[in-house]
Interface confidence: low
């Protein structure tokens, strides 16, 4: 990510105590928060600043992906003297401020977690009254989302020499183990993990040659659960169909 010259002396694990009036900008966020898909998570963020008794207008911002440049997922603004931070942006309506920015707390609640929410989040506060100042966490908090397996695609495809192959793709965190079962197969573990970048939760398993007609079942399993889907191969009818 782009580095800036903003002073970002952030202490994530241990809040430094600074004696007044030499308080300086700092932000305290944990390295990581973990939760299951479908649940809610709280991203803690507290800060200190050098402007004693500041009660002017302020904006609280959370962004995802990278600091300073990542897309905003939440933004709220508080008028002078107000403890109410009026929400201006909440991506998909799932982000809600839990903390009170007037009390140096920007903690955010994320509802209905999905695997796509598994990324790093950065909190930022901006003062815009008599004092113009801003500060953003540099390394942010990693939201680690876990999920039971879900088979996202199962299909039968033609392969050379009039043969057929089957593909099964599942998502989950931890990435699930995949196994195929079917006619004359027993259990075939043929999982090939996709690269982590961008598709870190997807796993694909291929059956390269389907030798018998019948039902082929893909099972995805991780520590949180399991999921099954099947495809049916009918070569003699000149078609293949899938049923889940």
């Amino acid at each position: 990510f782009v580095r800036t010259k903003i002073d970002t002396t952030e202490n994530l694990l241990n809040t430094e105590v600074h004696s007044s009036p030499a308080q300086r900008w700092s932000m305290q966020v944990p390295p990581e928060v973990s939760a299951e898909a479908g649940d809610a998570a709280v991203l803690p963020c507290t800060f200190t600043h050098p402007h004693r008794h500041y009660d002017g207008p302020l904006t609280a911002i959370w962004r995802a992906g990278e600091p300073y440049a990542g897309p905003q997922v939440f933004r709220c603004a508080a008028a002078r003297g107000s403890e109410l931070c009026q929400t201006a942006l909440s991506l998909h309506g799932r982000f809600r401020l839990l903390g009170n920015p007037r009390r140096n707390d920007l903690s955010l609640r994320v509802e209905r977690l999905a695997l796509a929410d598994d990324r790093r989040y950065f909190c930022r506060v901006e003062f815009a009254g008599d004092v113009h100042d801003r500060y953003e966490s540099r390394h942010g908090v990693r939201l680690h989302v876990t999920a039971a397996p879900r088979i996202v695609n199962i299909s039968v495809l033609p392969s050379p020499a009039h043969a057929f192959r089957a593909l099964c793709t599942a998502e989950g965190e931890p990435p699930p183990a995949l196994a195929w079962s079917g006619p004359a197969l027993g259990n075939s573990l043929a999982a090939v993990r996709s690269p982590r970048e961008g598709h870190g939760h997807l796993v694909t398993a291929e059956l390269p040659a389907l030798t018998h007609d019948g039902r082929y079942t893909c099972t995805a399993a991780n520590s949180l659960g399991r999921s099954e889907a099947s495809v049916y191969l009918f070569r003699f009818h000149g078609a293949s169909g899938a049923s889940t």
Partner: antibody
Framework: EVQLVESGGGLVQPGRSLKLSCAAS????????MAWVRQSPKKGLGWVAS????????YYGDSVKGRFTISRDSAKSTLYLQMSSLRSEDTATYYC?????????????WGQGVMVTVSS | DVQMTQSPSNLAASPGESVSINCKAG??????LAWYQQKPGKPNKLLIY???TLQSGTPSRFSGSGSGTDFTLTIRNLEPEDFGLYYC?????????FGSGTKLEIK
Amino acid sequence: EVQLVESGGGLVQPGRSLKLSCAASGFTFSDYYMAWVRQSPKKGLGWVASIDYDGYNTYYGDSVKGRFTISRDSAKSTLYLQMSSLRSEDTATYYCARHDSRFGSLFDYWGQGVMVTVSS
Amino acid sequence: DVQMTQSPSNLAASPGESVSINCKAGKSISKYLAWYQQKPGKPNKLLIYSGSTLQSGTPSRFSGSGSGTDFTLTIRNLEPEDFGLYYCQQHNEYPLTFGSGTKLEIK
């Protein structure tokens, strides 16, 4: 194969300083948070300090804050722990550990450890 | 800090048997507990995290259970290489804290 090899331990008098090193290999050093964890017969395993990818942020356990400094040199794939104002209770085996990339609060690889004895 | 209490401190068993090691957190840590194995002359090994998820390379005879404050590591059908020290660690919050350890010995 991931390898972490600590060095620099030994016998040191109370109040003096010592610097530990940890040579990392088998992975991209700059992609991981790193840590020092220590173990003594009295206190068992205890987290000492951690450092982020590029050394910008450092984190310390309460018992060493202000006395120990964790640092890293990505060009050398080496982690350091500068220990000053050493006390007898700092006597322990010190392990270099790699933070797991998915769970930043776990240690997925450890070194064999290096012994530090603080005694007069 | 979250206090981690591990029991028993010593355990003797024979190959083929099953054993359980307990770990109790001073406050709720959700499911975020890890187990490590320590053997002389070898680096510590992460076995289980998030209470029950096996780290890659951990044999299936190891299993973890529990949530909140009470957790258990179970080893079924003990193999000779399973003997050694076991530690729990909460990975719910900083500072990261460990249990005091359980020494598993051959009977």
